[in-house]
């Protein structure tokens, strides 16, 4: 598979790797989300491991307010991180592909 | 980097690999989008290479109606594909992680 197709596959499989641990197997509860972030997105998390930060993040992702993060909410989250990465990327011209 | 972080990096770098070819270097025009889809998401495209299908897809992605696809619109598109993959994934219990 092409790199982008592999990337999408990783997005899906990573979600289910953690959503399948407790409760609803198609949703991430707070502890599952915490584990996913700690293990799979350590660069995003950095040192923000305090409880309030996790609660805020969970609340921001949980648009339907069911105390869990479903796959659509997770995709929105990853898109937000990708957009942050993109802003960083666009801010460093020497790291960009050739100019048009 | 962890697989999910690599996946996000691929999302960003793939966009710029094609957006950097013509016109606005931070947006995909129709020909750039067509090339990205053909080369990077062949499984998604399948045999849908007719012009009308591309025009329709471009129109659906171009939410701000500027005839180009910016990074946010591209992320929405990838999220939609990921959600389709996820529906497929959830439909095959034998391919899922262990039950809760």
């Amino acid at each position: 598979a092409c790199p982008l197709e592999k990337a999408l596959d990783v997005m899906v499989s990573t979600f289910h790797k953690y959503s399948g641990k407790e409760g609803d197997k198609f949703k991430l509860n707070k502890s599952e989300l915490k584990e996913l972030l700690t293990r799979e997105l350590p660069s995003f998390l950095g040192k923000r491991t305090d409880e309030a930060a996790f609660q805020k993040l969970m609340s921001n992702l949980d648009s339907n307010r069911d105390n869990e993060v479903d796959f659509q909410e997770y995709c929105v989250f990853l898109s937000c991180i990708a957009m942050m990465c993109n802003e960083f990327f666009e801010g460093f011209p020497d790291k960009q592909p050739r100019k048009k | 980097a962890c697989p999910l972080e690599k996946a996000l990096d691929v999302m960003v770098s793939t966009f710029h690999k094609y957006s950097g070819k013509e016109g606005d270097k931070f947006k995909l025009n129709k020909s750039e989008l067509k090339e990205l889809l053909t080369r990077e998401l062949p499984s998604f495209l399948g045999k849908r290479t007719d012009e009308a299908a591309f025009q329709k897809l471009m129109s659906n992605l171009d939410s701000n109606r500027d005839n180009e696809v910016d990074f946010q619109e591209y992320c929405v598109f990838l999220s939609c594909i990921a959600m389709m993959c996820n529906e497929f994934f959830e439909g095959f219990p034998d391919k899922q992680p262990r039950k809760k």
């Epitope: 409760g23 707070k30 309030a52 609660q55 609340s59 069911d66 | -």
Partner: antibody
Framework: QVQLQESGPGLVKPSQTLSLTCTVS?????????WNWIRQHPGSKLEWIGH???????NYNPSLKNRLSMSRDTSKNQFSLKLSSVTAADTAVYYC?????????????WGQGTLVTVSS | DIQMTQSPSSLSASVGDRVTITCRAS??????LNWYQQKPGKAPKLLLY???RLHSGVPSRFSGSGSGTDYTLTISSLQPEDFATYYC?????????FGGGTKVEIK
């Protein structure tokens, strides 16, 4: 200390639109919280109306959804409620509340409430 | 919608008494249960969230327990300022719903 203050007319005629505004002070109107409307009917029953939160995400009580509209103005630290086609059954004390980001999303701060009477 | 049923609807007690109020949900609410106290003419105030976590500034005589569909609020030693109406509320799913209230009166 977070404070919420409801404002709006205390008397609304049947079939008209009830409009209320809540002003938040002592806390920036941040994305970390959802901002709610809750009403209490004369018999003391509490009813959740709806809320507005992260990225402008809005959820309404399905029982009121087709008559409801909520919005916010972050520059003024305000959020608003509009309830159309009111009847006597909409007579209640209306509270604006802040929904915490903790487990179960409790309502941790409340306005003092404003009585709205629907009568001709 | 999830229905919340409180019992009793009212009770009489004396200062120093141990008081227990129960709340039953129509389905499992996974401990996402909050309790509020309301005095006449005032807005409700948060006491406990997520079944048993005390909101800041709430005295430790208030405690909560339960799981699944059945939850309890306990006041270990009733104080004069505790005479009020108590409401449970589920935070498990939308729409948020409240119990009918339990009025605690002086015996």
């Amino acid at each position: 200390q977070v404070q919420l203050q409801e404002s709006g007319p205390g008397l609304v005629k049947p079939s008209q639109t009830l409009s209320l505004t809540c002003t938040v002070s002592g806390d920036s109107f941040t994305n970390d919280y959802y901002w709610n409307w809750i009403r209490q009917h004369p018999g003391s029953k509490l009813e959740w109306i709806g809320h507005i939160g992260y990225g402008g995400n809005i959820n309404y009580n399905p029982s009121l959804k087709n008559r409801l509209s909520m919005s916010r103005d972050t520059s003024k630290n305000q959020f608003s409620l509009k309830l159309s086609s009111v009847t006597a059954a909409d007579t209640a004390v209306y509270y604006c509340t802040r929904e915490s980001f903790y487990d179960g999303y409790p309502f941790d701060y409340w306005g003092q409430g404003t009585l709205v009477t629907v009568s001709s | 919608d999830i229905q919340m049923t409180q019992s009793p609807s009212s009770l009489s007690a004396s200062v120093g008494d141990r008081v227990t109020i129960t709340c039953r949900a129509s389905q499992d609410i996974r401990n996402y249960l909050n309790w509020y106290q309301q005095k006449p003419g005032k807005a409700p105030k948060l006491l406990l969230y997520y079944t048993s976590r005390l909101h800041s500034g709430v005295p430790s005589r208030f405690s909560g327990s339960g799981s699944g569909t059945d939850y309890t609020l306990t006041i270990s030693s009733l104080q004069p300022e505790d005479f009020a109406t108590y409401y449970c509320q589920q935070g498990n799913s939308l729409p948020r719903t409240f119990g009918g209230g339990t009025k605690v009166e002086i015996k």
